[in-house]
């Protein structure tokens, strides 16, 4: 016979030879990082018609790692779903916790014992310190020193020593987060007041008032004859002016050949802007002005625009 | 005081059902991961099955493996065994077992007085 | 799966003796190990973990030593109450097994 078998998990004992005699026996013995257990043979003979007996290394199994439970509030996830050595254990936590430690322990051969690379972690609540505080405004739970998971907190402004209130700038209500962090950034208290939008030759529809605080919204049409350019629903922003920009109403300008179309109420160049659905006069078709042929005339965007609901 | 409390056991034909269950009080019930351990009537004693402390991980005996459902209620402080399709080598007193705490190794420092199982025609 | 075996499978001893009880691992199990305590008719009682660990309200005449595939329990000195039937239990990987058993008898 030529030289015997190899395999993954045992060697031969002693030096392999060139070849062996019929008759002949070789040993087997598992390989570092295997043990044996009974009862497969480990060894095989050279047989008459020049081959080896059948032999298989099922009899060395792989060491393997000590069992690992859950960490509490988390999971041990073994890789390939075993502990044996060359594998790797992976550690989650459930939502609200944290791991503290490593998140991937490997199991390691050290001499012929299996052992895991180190220490298994373990999952910590998620905890927050206290929101920050802001000017002029405070939040709930104040007197709370430590927040849990998901644990929200609301601000609201304080009264306004003058004639113009407060307004909260940004989200009210926040919430402690995965790696213990607010959900966003705290929100402001500031006065909010834009000026009073003045439309020539328009005028508005709705939010009526006498002052313009944060989001006050106010929707605008032009008089008879008259487009709309910009938007004709504006907010007032966190930076106490109007957006988009106060809107203006330009004069339709007469058509070069044929006479423009009947206009109830206002033009508009802006194809993206409803006007609202009903006014005091009923539906209004909107139209883009008609295209001017004269020299000299400002060239509006072409096409017509579709009747607003 | 922890105590465990087995119930649910009795004389069932080969092939029928049984449900153990294990009532759990003075401690924490669901931090804890928790077996069954069974001991043939004058023989050793086998491990049957494991739950870990929110029931995500379940480990079962070969010999049990298909037929026997563990569970856990952890508002309810109880732990359960389904046996189903149940032999006459099923015959034993069941134990309901809490697993020591320690993150490596399996060790039970808490044992229920266990239940009379015996499957008989 | 990994198998126990204890020895001897019964003894006889004196109060006062000192007796030690070997449990064998069919392959390296590292310090994994339990030693338990049962009494006729309850439920058996954790004495040992992790090889040499007493359990707490375990009286210091116990104790336990060894490692890999090797493990011994050894009881001092015997008292009356210690007559009953010991089991090692291996905690390494499951399924999770143990020895079959150890009998304790007064002589």
């Known amino acids: 016979c030529e030289e015997p078998p190899t395999f993954e998990a045992m060697e031969l004992i002693g030096k392999p030879k060139p070849y062996y005699e019929i008759g002949e026996r070789v040993d087997y013995k598992c390989k570092k990082g295997y043990f044996y257990i009974p009862p497969l043979a480990t060894h095989t003979i050279c047989d008459r018609n020049h081959t080896w007996l059948p032999v298989s290394d099922d009899a060395c199994y792989r060491e393997t790692c000590p069992y690992i439970r859950d960490p509490l509030n988390g999971q041990a996830v073994p890789a390939n779903g075993t502990y044996e050595f060359g594998y790797q254990m992976h550690f989650i936590c459930n939502e609200g916790y944290y791991l503290i430690g490593e998140e991937i322990l490997y199991c390691e051969l050290k001499g012929s014992v299996a052992i895991w690379s180190g220490k298994p972690p373990i999952c910590e609540k998620v905890l927050c310190t206290p929101p920050p505080k802001i000017k002029n405004g405070k939040h709930t739970f104040s007197e709370v020193e430590v927040f849990e998971y998901l644990d929200a907190v609301t601000y609201s402004c304080d009264p306004a020593p003058g004639p113009d209130p407060f307004s909260l700038i940004g989200e009210s209500t926040i919430y402690c987060g995965d790696n213990s962090v607010w959900s966003r950034a705290a929100p402001e208290c500031k006065v909010v007041k834009c000026r009073f939008p003045v439309v020539e030759n328009g005028k508005q529809i709705s939010g009526f008032g006498k002052k313009f605080y944060y989001k006050a919204t106010v929707m605008f049409e032009c008089d008879k004859g008259f487009y709309l350019d910009g938007s004709d629903t504006i907010v007032c922003d966190s930076n106490s002016t109007w957006d988009p920009p106060v809107p203006k109403c330009l004069k339709v300008l007469p058509p070069s050949s044929t006479k423009p179309p009947a206009l109830s109420h206002s033009v508009s160049t802006s194809s993206t802007t409803k006007s609202p659905a009903s006014s005091a006069s009923g539906p209004r078709p909107t139209y883009k002005p008609p295209v001017s042929n004269y020299p000299g005339y400002p060239k509006p965007e072409e096409g017509i625009l579709d009747s607003l609901d | 005081e922890v105590q465990l409390v087995e119930s649910g056991g009795g004389l069932v034909k080969p092939g029928g059902s049984l449900r153990l269950s294990c009532a759990a009080s003075?401690?924490?019930?669901?931090?804890?991961?928790m077996s069954w351990i069974r001991q043939a009537p004058g023989k050793g004693l086998e491990w049957v099955s494991y739950?870990?402390?929110?029931?995500?991980?379940?480990y079962y005996a070969d010999s049990v493996k298909g037929r026997f459902t563990i569970s856990r209620d952890n508002a309810k402080n109880s732990l359960y065994l389904q046996m189903n399709s149940l032999k006459a080598e099923d015959t034993a007193v069941y134990y309901c077992?809490?697993?020591?705490?320690?993150?490596?190794?399996?060790?039970?420092?808490?044992w229920g007085q266990g239940t009379l199982v015996t499957v008989s025609s | 799966d990994i198998q126990l075996t204890q020895s001897p499978s019964s003894l006889s001893a004196s109060v006062g003796d000192r007796v030690t009880i070997t449990c064998r691992a069919s392959?390296?199990?590292?310090?994994?190990l339990s030693w338990y305590q049962q009494k006729p008719g309850k439920a058996p009682k954790l004495l040992i973990y992790?090889?040499?660990r007493l359990q707490n309200g375990v009286p210091s005449r116990f104790s336990g030593s060894g490692s890999d595939t090797d493990f011994t329990l050894t009881i001092s000195s015997l008292q009356p109450e210690d007559f009953a039937t010991y089991f090692c239990?291996?905690?390494?990987?499951?399924?999770?097994?143990f020895g079959q058993g150890t009998k304790l008898e007064i002589k």
């Open positions: 077992a809490r697993d020591i705490t320690d993150v490596v190794g399996v060790s039970f420092d808490y």
């Open positions: 003075g401690f924490t019930f669901s931090d804890y991961y």
């Open positions: 739950i870990s402390s929110s029931g995500s991980s379940i």
């Open positions: 392959r390296s199990i590292s310090t994994y």
């Open positions: 992790d090889a040499s």
């Open positions: 239990q291996q905690s390494y990987n499951p399924p999770w097994t």
